[in-house]
């Protein structure tokens, strides 16, 4: 089997990616400048550390989490890095254009990079549903469309529903999940005879996927607290996220054992279920008033995640063509919805407590926000899926799905790789 890209992709990818990069450089040249008002060097370091946590989550965490395929681990990690690098650049520009541009040039701060990294994370969550079935040229399209859709969604939600940075970014879980699932639905589904082994997991890649899950587990509190307004809110968010992910680990491992007839633990269940609590508390992590609530939420999320991992892959494999080990899409879609429901419940309690008398209105607004996120995710996902089906991108043949050798040069083409 040749390790070269098909000739057409060799022409298409470098030209497409480098032209795009040149365009981004020109946009940065004409429209951006650094924040000149930075006074506090200690503050700079603290702010950078949050951004660094997010980058570790994205590059190592999500990069390795998606690397469990027997013959697609290299591509998973490297393609994730490629998408992150491209996504961050476009997200910085887009956020600047949408929020600052009327007042002149886009001012780039460390916060801009933090926000852009979180936007790019959306793509890395979504792509789990399609990795192995698309080439880099197609992934470039996916990055551009998804980051643009998320940026516009956040702006619309901010303007119409008056939500803050944290709240409109926390729709990322639901948005990314439904975007990825709708893209996957558009792509060719059946795996031809003889290629089924490629979408199975192997021990060493599974270990690297577990490493990715561990990095995400460690840094999830940083993600959930990154955009909050006050030190107290950030502290609450860190604590609540930590309690939730701690409980979801215990639930994931014991629940996985419980779900197996022989009491064995499934690597696939554990990879995603350990993160369940972090996703479920994301929206309301700063609002949860006591640890036990966060822990209960982590428990419920862990159970939902294990249950979903047990019963949903069959359905997702048939309908969407998503392999059994790519469970992030439906996992995040269920847990994201759980998180949004918890937020609505807490919002009702807040409205009652404030003696506001407009509970129905507040709930309606929150449901409207969530519905808008799902609708935009589905529509932009379907659009992306249709774009990715165009012949121009020279998509890999179904027989070469989940195969590193299509994309990478290996000194020895070992079949069992």
């Amino acid at each position: 089997m040749s390790s070269k890209y098909p000739r057409s992709v060799r022409r298409c990818l470098p030209l497409w990616a480098l032209t795009l990069e040149a365009a981004l450089i020109l946009l940065f040249y004409f429209f951006t400048h650094y924040d000149a008002s930075l006074e506090d060097q200690k503050g700079l370091v603290a702010s950078y550390q949050v951004g660094q946590d997010l980058t570790v989550m994205a590059a190592i965490g999500l990069g390795f989490l998606t690397s469990s395929f027997r013959r697609h681990s290299w591509s998973s990690v490297a393609f994730n890095l490629f998408m992150l690098a491209l996504g961050v650049q476009w997200a910085i520009l887009l956020d600047g254009f949408l929020s600052q541009f009327p007042s002149g040039k886009v001012v780039i701060t460390l916060f801009s990079i933090r926000l852009a990294t979180m936007s790019a994370l959306s793509v890395l969550i979504s792509v789990d549903a399609v990795l192995g079935k698309v080439n880099l040229a197609q992934l470039v399209v996916m990055v551009l469309v998804e980051v643009t859709a998320l940026g516009n969604l956040r702006m619309v939600i901010s303007n119409i529903f008056n939500t803050d940075y944290h709240m409109n970014m926390m729709h990322i879980y639901v948005f990314a999940a439904y975007f990825g699932l709708s893209v996957a639905w558009c792509l060719p589904k059946p795996l031809p005879e003889g290629t089924e082994d490629k979408d199975q997991t192997a021990t060493i890649p599974s270990l690297s996927a577990m490493l990715g899950a561990l990095f995400l587990w460690m840094f999830w509190p940083s993600f959930n607290s990154a955009l909050l307004r006050s030190p107290i809110e950030r502290k609450n968010a860190v604590f609540n996220t930590y309690y939730a992910v701690a409980v979801s680990v215990v639930t994931a491992i014991s629940g996985s054992s419980l779900a197996h007839p022989q009491g064995k633990i499934s690597k696939t269940y554990v990879h995603s279920a350990v993160l369940a609590g972090g996703v479920a508390v994301g929206t309301s992590c700063h609002l949860i008033p006591s640890p036990w609530l966060a822990m209960v939420l982590g428990l419920v999320a862990g159970l939902i995640s294990v249950g979903g991992a047990k019963y949903l892959p069959g359905c997702c494999n048939r309908v969407l063509g998503i392999p059994h080990s790519s469970i992030m899409g439906y996992n995040f879609s269920l847990l994201g919805l759980l998180g949004e429901i918890i937020y609505i419940v807490l919002l009702v309690l807040d409205t009652v407590g404030a003696g506001n008398g407009m509970i129905g209105f507040q709930v309606l607004l929150s449901i409207g926000e969530l519905s808008l996120a799902i609708v935009i995710a589905l529509m932009s996902g379907l659009l992306t899926g249709l774009l990715l089906n165009l012949k121009i991108w020279k998509a890999p043949h179904e027989a070469k799905y989940f195969d590193d050798q299509v994309f990478w040069k290996f000194p020895h083409l070992a079949v069992g790789f």
Epitope: L38, S47, N162, P231, L349
Partner: antibody
Framework: EVQLVETGGGVVQPGRSLRLSCAAS????????MHWVRQAPGKGLEWVAV????????YYVDSVKGRFTISRDNSKNTLYLQMNSLRAEETAIYFC????????????????????WGQGTLVTVSS | DIQLTQSPSSLSASVGDRVTITCRAS??????LNWYQQKPGEAPKLLIY???TLQSGAPSRFSGSGSGTDYTLTISSLQPEDSATFYC?????????FGQGTKLEIK
């Protein structure tokens, strides 16, 4: 005792720049958001800008966007307002104020308010 | 942007009177409303925050109420030192606008 002292005001020509400072003492400056509010002679209060506790987020009133920059140095307990392209109608007393927040019993979202104000510094924009 | 409209713009009352000032928001601000008092030549002082909580050190004759879009500042028994301009402010969403102010004079 919480104290906020504004300095840097004065007479400046239209189109020119000025930088205001607000020195804070008596509290942990790096834990609080800070605001600038102005008041034209004989007029009401007009909110100008806010900066979050860590300097990560800044918001401005539309009329000053792109011309004014709020910043802070937490190591020096100082808030700044860099004002460029000043206009005659921006003649005002500029106050800095500390933002505090509270969790009202029965609610879950923090509510914000300005609990301490400086005495203000007068900026006169005139040719 | 959220607009705040105070009424009346000015009023004159006698010592001992009960005085009410209202503040109406252009949309629901969910109790993110504060009241400030400013005397001539002084900086504003916080009186009431979160619509109804009295700031420590503020006289107990001041009280606040309201929810949604309509809020009220009440002085139960007017004192000579209450002569000032009162402002409401929303902190629901930036820009954090102030009302135009209500000037209170003592007869």
């Amino acid at each position: 005792e919480v104290q906020l002292v504004e300095t840097g005001g004065g007479v400046v020509q239209p189109g020119r720049s000025l930088r205001l400072s607000c020195a804070a003492s008596g509290f942990s400056f790096s834990n609080y958001g800070m605001h600038w509010v102005r008041q034209a002679p004989g007029k009401g209060l007009e909110w100008v800008a806010v900066i979050w506790f860590d300097g990560s987020i800044k918001y401005y009133v539309d009329s000053v966007k792109g011309r004014f920059t709020i910043s802070r140095d937490n190591s020096k307990n100082t808030l700044y307002l860099q004002m460029n392209s000043l206009r005659a109608e921006e003649t005002a007393i500029y106050f800095c104020a500390r933002e505090n927040s509270v969790l009202v019993p029965g609610t879950i979202r923090r509510r914000y308010y300005l609990d301490y104000w400086g005495q203000g510094t007068l900026v006169t924009v005139s040719s | 942007d959220i607009q705040l409209t105070q009424s009346p713009s000015s009023l004159s009352a006698s010592v001992g009177d009960r005085v009410t000032i209202t503040c109406r928001a252009s949309q629901s601000i969910s109790s993110y409303l504060n009241w400030y008092q400013q005397k001539p030549g002084e900086a504003p002082k916080l009186l009431i925050y979160v619509a109804s909580t009295l700031q420590s050190g503020a006289p107990s004759r001041f009280s606040g109420s309201g929810s949604g879009t309509d809020y009220t500042l009440t002085i139960s028994s007017l004192q000579p030192e209450d002569s000032a301009t009162f402002y409401c402010q929303q902190t629901y969403s930036p820009p954090y606008t102030f009302g135009q102010g209500t000037k209170l004079e003592i007869k």
